[in-house]
Interface confidence: medium
Amino acid sequence: MMTGTIETTGNISAEKGGSIILQCHLSSTTAQVTQVNWEQQDQLLAICNADLGWHISPSFKDRVAPGPGLGLTLQSLTVNDTGEYFCIYHTYPDGTYTGRIFLEVLESSVAEHGARFQIP
């Protein structure tokens, strides 16, 4: 039975050219996290594997940095980065948990940032 829940940064916005941290946190389960996938719509951005560590997709290696923690840092943002991002936690024995984040990249310099997410 899957008892865990995913907390995310939710809906966030950032300025074009800036950077943003995407964070998810899995709680309320004792399942072991074996891998976390970060995906944007249908594209795989990065993977953090418990055995092998971080792997960044070659298509994004210039603009994506691992961490902090199991989060992901997006750099040099463009308006094309606007959209849904998913953190997919592969766990044993529970199975898969998915969290959703919506990022809006704004042209304006008055982009309103969401509250900074803290891992408890």
Partner: nanobody
Framework: EVQLVESGGGLVQPGGSLRLSCAAS????????MGWFRQAPGKEREGVSA???????TYSDSVKGRFTISRDNSNQILYLQMNSLRAEDTAVYYC???????????????????WGQGTLVTVSS
Amino acid sequence: EVQLVESGGGLVQPGGSLRLSCAASGYKYGVYSMGWFRQAPGKEREGVSAICSGGRTTYSDSVKGRFTISRDNSNQILYLQMNSLRAEDTAVYYCAARPLWTGDCDLSSSWYKTWGQGTLVTVSS
């Protein structure tokens, strides 16, 4: 940290067979896919075969029907059974590991960041 150690290479005559093994150690969960690559003298490293999520397998055109990849999950050992060997199969063979996901099961080395030291296979009469 995962470490990969290949064995089973050697000298074999054309038409002969060899079985390569790759033992993984230092893992916590074993949640990754694995592949075999090779590098012939003076050539670039190329993908040979991989075993991916759900036990799916893939092979390069040059070895399809001659080589068989398999994996012993309980002992974290990867195998490559090589039959009908040819002179052009001569190379150093490497095993590699990458994260497991449900995307394409291909032989791109981009996602393989953990490599063994290699084992030499020489096919000659």
